[in-house]
């Protein structure tokens, strides 16, 4: 059962599985949320009672019952793990810690204007884990605005110690603000030979990639395939880090393969989700359990149910024998990885999908589009919304995006003269404008925050955010879309479609179905020439046929411009202005989002 | 009806700047952009420039980057066109226009032309 | 730049004639072609946009064709009043350019 809140001077009996040192019990149990293995913690507060050695360790602990004996403890604060919660979880940590000196490998000393700064330049660069930052009270002159980063083997400080006048505080790179690039290319018959941090049994190249993504010191990885010569190298991932921060030497081998961890495109696609079903594979670990199970979907489900099974394998059942059920084989491991990796012996393995909940909900893969035609089917557009205005009548007055579960956005034009927000309602998982009816459920609008720079669409700034007043459940139907990477803006987006209720030329009325329409996108400086009237800046975006005849037009204004990438879908543009609807040689001019993300994830992230 | 009236011919010396006026009616000013057109005696149209009088924003022929410079003053209505540093052959007549499109078309008004001559 | 080289330089027709101006682009320009009609001492005059829609209040005798790179202005009936020069310009991409004109005289 999901327990959230924390335990006041309570310490958990037992149980140690290691012990690393936090800022606060809120960041204790979102380590250990991340960690394989743990399922509860005991955090140690600073305190006249305590043994300062002792202050700020995080105890992570494990369960056969899931849970532990409590003992009184002045300063200890215990909790549970997120592991066996639903809800969305992040390692996100925007908190500065002041007097707080987080201990770490020292790499990199430079002066910063500020703690904000020094963050930033954590964020960007590709050791840091986490910094700290001597402020310019700091009493030794020559230290005062010093910029520290550092790293540790855990990405946790190896020690923190009470120090005046300096903060500290994490890379802010799990929060998808790092400008890193996001490099997801895998590179067939590659051996990246650099130092290894660490080993682990991984069944392709993909989960290897994902595992290195979500271990702190990772930067890139090789991984032998199960052909590779070396019997005993099969299956083996090895993950890798350098100075340089980039593999030194890349060496051709054939059945290797080698890539870059995904940490700055980690909230773009899923890397901690491996749904994938390995067929005649065994996945060997410790085993927790053998359950009876009619398929590896359902094996696959009670592992994920099973709050300690980190991975499983089937073996389908032999004729009629056992109702025709076959062995579900629920395993762990210390690091959430096999122990060894077998072919040929007729099982079905894979993951539990409990960790997919770590994962950006926009990474779930939506239901096979519809090719041709320009009416939608339900579901096809999961993220689309239509906001309407209940004044004076009410009406469909833009699209809208859903990108997380209670924000939608659009585009700033959208609310020249609309006075509040009262008089906005936002429906989702619509297909037909004349499915809205009195009794249609809707989500009020709380807020509508319009950038503070916007003065018209042609302008640029074209971007609003609306902060409803419920949450969104979702569903097939309504769910986010993405927001593309700041390491991802050099991206060549090839799969792009424009949706809307909009008009479908020029003086014609709101289309009752969802209309969609794959457009290509046009470089600024080809945009540019169209519009010589207008500065078309970095912050736009340009999308149209050269023919026209397709495009955006009056209606579908605020709504996204979507484009597929490795699978997963990104909000690339917000439908913002152009000249007429489908004119030959005019694209149509749309928000680039990925010059937003920063403005995005502050308004929506703010407390 | 939508009129571009402008301002009267000039007489300068090689060297010297000269500022046309181009004031607008009969429509919304920040509506449409106004560009700015050249003809020597004699000879074709030439692009100088244009200016969106809702943003200020000003797009340059490359051969008059450096020379012209185009601005406009929305509370009158009025769009100018200075150019610096004349020569013999900046003699001719100079038209601004307004465009048919809101973001750069056909020019469906112009002005009467401004005739500058530059003669030492 | 976009170069458009216009044919002829002059035409002399007779009144009541069909008179044919050509225009060349040095480049495509899909539809984004406009004509222009300039008397003694007047500006232009906007005949024609987007290769062959007319302009509000131009007589019907006037018409436009064409597409990619050659495009033709038609008078189909030559009237007294049609004597003057007349320019096309293309507007697919900054900065816009006009035909060296070709002038229009009755035989």
């Known amino acids: 059962e999901c327990v959230t809140q924390l335990l006041k001077d309570t310490c958990f009996e037992g149980g140690d599985i290691t012990t690393v040192f936090t800022p606060s019990a809120k960041y204790c149990q979102v380590v250990c949320t991340y960690h394989p293995r743990c399922l509860l913690f005991t955090f140690t507060a600073e305190s006249p009672s305590e043994d300062p050695t002792r202050w700020f360790t995080c105890v992570l602990k494990d369960s056969v019952t899931e849970t532990l004996p409590r003992v009184n403890r002045t300063a200890a604060i215990s909790g549970y793990s997120f592991k066996q919660c639903s809800h969305q979880i992040s390692a996100c940590n925007k908190d500065i810690y002041v007097d707080l000196d987080m201990k770490g490998i020292n790499y990199n000393s430079s002066v910063a204007k500020s703690a904000q700064e020094c963050q930033e330049r954590c964020t960007d660069d590709v050791h840091c884990h986490f910094f700290t930052y001597a402020t310019r009270q700091f009493p030794s002159l020559e230290h005062r605005n010093i910029c520290l980063l550092k790293h540790t083997q855990t990405g946790t400080p190896t020690r923190i110690t009470k120090l005046d006048k300096v903060v500290s505080g994490f890379s802010l790179k799990s929060c998808a603000l790092s400008n890193l690039a996001c490099i997801r290319d895998i590179f067939p018959n590659t051996v990246f030979a650099d130092s290894n941090i660490d080993s682990v049994m991984a069944p392709d190249a993909f989960v290897c990639g994902r595992i290195c993504t979500h271990h702190p010191g990772c930067l890139f990885f090789t991984f032998f395939s199960q052909e590779w010569p070396k019997e005993s190298q099969r299956n083996l991932c090895l993950l890798k880090t350098s100075e340089s921060g980039l593999p030194s030497t890349r060496i051709k081998k054939s059945k290797a393969l080698s890539g870059f961890s995904l940490q700055s495109c980690r909230h773009s696609i899923p890397v901690f989700c491996h749904s994938s079903f390995y067929h005649d594979t065994d996945f060997l670990g410790e085993e927790l359990d053998i359950v009876a199970a009619k398929s590896h979907e359902a094996c696959q489900k009670l592992c994920t149910n099973a709050v300690r099974c980190q991975f499983f394998t089937y073996t389908p059942a032999q004729a009629s024998c056992n109702e025709g059920k076959g062995k579900c084989y629920l395993k762990l491991s210390s690091n959430g990885s096999p122990t060894k990796i077998l072919h040929g012996r007729g099982g079905i393995s894979g993951y539990t999908l409990r960790l997919c909940k770590m994962d950006n909900e926009c990474t779930t893969k939506i239901k096979p589009r519809i090719v041709g035609g320009t009416a939608s089917v339900r579901g096809e557009w999961p993220w689309q919304v239509t906001l309407h205005t209940t004044s004076p009548t009410q009406r469909h007055l833009c699209g809208g995006s859903i990108i997380g579960n209670q924000w939608i956005l659009t585009a700033a034009h959208c609310f020249y003269g609309v006075e509040s927000p009262k008089i906005l309602r936002v429906y989702s998982g619509i297909l037909n404008q004349s499915e809205i009816k009195e009794d249609t459920s809707f989500f009020g609008v709380q807020e509508i925050i319009i950038h503070d720079q916007y003065k018209m669409a042609e302008s640029g700034y074209d971007i609003a955010l609306l902060k409803l007043e419920t949450t969104v459940n979702y569903t097939d139907s309504q769910r986010p879309i993405c927001l593309p990477s700041k390491g991802d803006r050099n991206v060549i987006y090839t799969d792009c479609w424009v949706t809307g209720w909009g008009y479908r030329k020029l003086r014609d009325k709101i289309q009752n179905t969802l209309q969609k329409a794959k457009i290509p996108l046009v470089t600024n400086e080809e945009c540019q020439k169209r519009y010589r009237g207008h500065k078309i800046t970095h912050k736009m975006i340009c999308a149209g046929y050269r023919e026209g005849g397709k495009d955006a037009c009056k209606g579908d204004s605020g709504g996204p411009l979507s484009c597929k990438h490795n699978e997963v879908w990104h909000l690339v543009g917000i439908t913002s202005w152009g000249e007429g609807c489908a004119q030959r040689e005019r694209p149509g001019v749309y928000t680039n989002v990925v010059e937003y993300v920063d403005w995005i994830l502050e308004k929506t992230q703010a407390v | 009806q939508v009129q571009l009236v402008q301002s009267g011919a000039e007489v300068k010396k090689p060297g010297a700047s000269v500022k046309v006026s181009c004031k607008a009616s009969g429509y919304t000013f920040t509506n449409y952009l106004i560009e700015w057109v050249r003809q020597a005696p004699g000879q074709g149209l030439e692009w100088i420039g244009v200016?969106?009088?809702?943003?200020?924003?000003?797009n340059y022929n490359e051969n008059f980057k450096d020379r012209a410079t185009l601005t406009a003053d929305t509370s009158i209505s009025t769009a100018y066109m200075e150019l610096s540093r004349l020569r013999s052959d900046d003699t001719a007549v100079y038209f601004c226009?307004?465009?048919?499109?809101?973001?750069?078309?056909?020019?469906?008004?112009w002005g009467q032309g401004t005739t500058v001559t530059v003669s030492s | 730049d976009i170069v458009m080289t216009q044919s002829p330089d002059s035409l002399a027709v007779s009144l009541g004639e069909r008179a044919t101006i050509n225009c060349k682009a040095s480049q495509s320009v899909s539809n984004d072609v406009a004509w222009y009609q300039q008397k003694p001492g007047q500006p232009p005059k906007l005949l024609i946009y987007?290769?062959?829609n007319r302009y509000t209040g131009v007589p019907d005798r006037f018409s436009g064709s064409g597409s990619g790179t050659d495009f033709t202005l038609t008078i189909s009936s030559l009237q007294a009043e049609d004597v003057a020069v007349y320019f096309c310009?293309?507007?697919?991409?900054?900065?816009?350019?006009f035909g060296g004109g070709t002038k229009l005289e009755i035989k």
């Open positions: 200016i969106n009088p809702g943003s200020g924003y000003t």
């Open positions: 987007y290769i062959s």
């Open positions: 310009q293309q507007d697919y991409s900054s900065p816009p350019t």
């Open positions: 226009a307004r465009t048919y499109g809101k973001y750069g078309g056909a020019m469906d008004f």
